[in-house]
Amino acid sequence: AGVFELQIHSFGPGPGPGAPRSPCSARLPCRLFFRVCLKPGLSEEAAESPCALGAALSARGPVYTEQPGAPAPDLPLPDGLLQVPFRDAWPGTFSFIIETWREELGDQIGGPAWSLLARVAGRRRLAAGGPWARDIQRAGAWELRFSYRARCEPPAVGTACTRLCRPRSAPSRCGPGLRPCAPLEDECEAPLVCRAGCSPEHGFCEQPGECRCLEGWTGPLCTVPVSTSSCLSPRGPSSATTGCLVPGPGPCDGNPCANGGSCSETPRSFECTCPRGFYGLRCEVSGVTCADGPCFNGGLCVGGADPDSAYICHCPPGFQGSNCEKRVDRCSLQPCRNGGLCLDLGHALRCRCRAGFAGPRCEHDLDDCAGRACANGGTCVEGGGAHRCSCALGFGGRDCRERADPCAARPCAHGGRCYAHFSGLVCACAPGYMGARCEFPVHPDGASALPAAPPGLRPGDPQRYL
């Protein structure tokens, strides 16, 4: 466990021409606040998860009134850090979104109004416990300067906050096999000992003495497979003897969603579906009108002229939620072919193709006949998503590169003997048979079923198959 900390240093006009108009005026004084959203991973998949590492809102900054005629300066900022606690290991790579919001404090009916001024995003590598990292990001004509770090909460230490430390029992050194806990040299690394008997295959622990079960296993030592057939409770019923899940506390217990929001569990945490007029991680932001721009991702806001009348966001294709903040799961239609992995990036669908396949939907089989040569005069034959080479006589193998033994298939009938020949094979027929493969019997009266043998070739002579 630990905390991601964000310190905003300045928010103001960026360098270069086209300085932005001040967001505040004498008629409409305002103040700023910030929102940070963190997602695990550097990769494109990070776009799929909604603030899976956590999110935080800053306090409101000092009230600012623009001086007439003066250029927009750096705007006064809220005090303090934005802190995003994380319960599990720090992932080391993460994506962030930092939003700058304006709160207008004019005499409008119904209290303050909010609007989004700027949004910046990026992907970074960061080890927990390291120094502050400085960054500058630009959004349009605005520039945001900030620092960030991740730090572990005791007793966790390490670059991922997964090692545990405890005070030394002896002043001089740590116990056998245990290292000092840098940078806390007066402490020792604590061995992570799970509860005695905890199944090594189906259980794990994040704190000493506990035994947490992997999905599909239950019981105090995670040794009982879950069977849902006799289970009645919503999250699975109750006893270790029946092998049913005990409904322990879940992330939605006590409903963390405010203002009538409904909670649904996600693999990492929970997600709130907010009623109209509210949004935020826990539906805590309220009093919003269309003037505040509450519809994300290009949604069109309708109605909501004042805070008492609800607005409606008409979402663009691919987005949903009362504020168009959620992405439709297009991957559920499995558009990627040939076992490709689907990634919904919002602006586009991407397919990660398995080896041997390519194309935007993994539709091209790289092993097909296109651009493929069969050696030694063989011809390529496609079929069933694969290909094969039909080889010329005397050659075999996947690409017709191997010299084939023409006699391997025993081509000479009726006991004829096969001889390999540079141009193919020769059959020496047993008495009473003739033909290239000894397939024709010689009639008892000396005539064959074929026209008379060519001059100089008696029945029984070897026949060469060209």
Epitope: L333, Q334, P335, R337, G359, P360, R361, E363
Partner: nanobody, 120 residues
Framework: EVQLVESGGGEVQPGGSLRLSCAAS????????MGWYRQAPGKQRELVAG???????KYAESVKGRFTFSRDNAKNTVYLQMSSLRAEDTAVYYC??????????????WGQGTLVTVKP
């Protein structure tokens, strides 16, 4: 540009039936995947049924045995035959298609949606 036009929505009593149609038109090189999603008030949009990139037909668990998905390749049209309808099937039903506009370019398209209401 590709257009998806849905039809067949309406109001029906529980246990009743409806048949939705969705026709794709425009610059279509080939259709990679196509199907039906639905969105009930206050809920997430979810897949109902469709054919996948590999040509398999896929159904949501909640509609298996009640809804039948079919397609007419020659007309670039898909259908959803909905039987034994329940109140919880009430939603806006959207047609979706993953379409190659040429050999190497593919895009996702949504229809405008058609409302299905199931009430006594």
């Amino acid at each position: 540009e590709v257009q998806l036009v849905e039809s067949g929505g309406g109001e029906v009593q529980p246990g009743g039936s409806l048949r939705l149609s969705c026709a794709a038109s425009g610059s279509i090189f080939s259709i990679n995947a196509m199907g039906w999603y639905r969105q009930a008030p206050g809920k997430q949009r979810e897949l109902v049924a469709g054919f996948t990139g590999d040509g398999m037909t896929k159904y949501a668990e909640s509609v298996k045995g009640r809804f039948t998905f079919s397609r007419d390749n020659a007309k670039n049209t898909v259908y959803l035959q909905m039987s034994s309808l329940r109140a919880e099937d009430t939603a806006v039903y959207y047609c979706a298609a993953d379409v190659f506009t040429d050999r190497d370019h593919v895009d996702w398209y949504w229809g405008q949606g058609t409302l299905v209401t199931v009430k006594p």
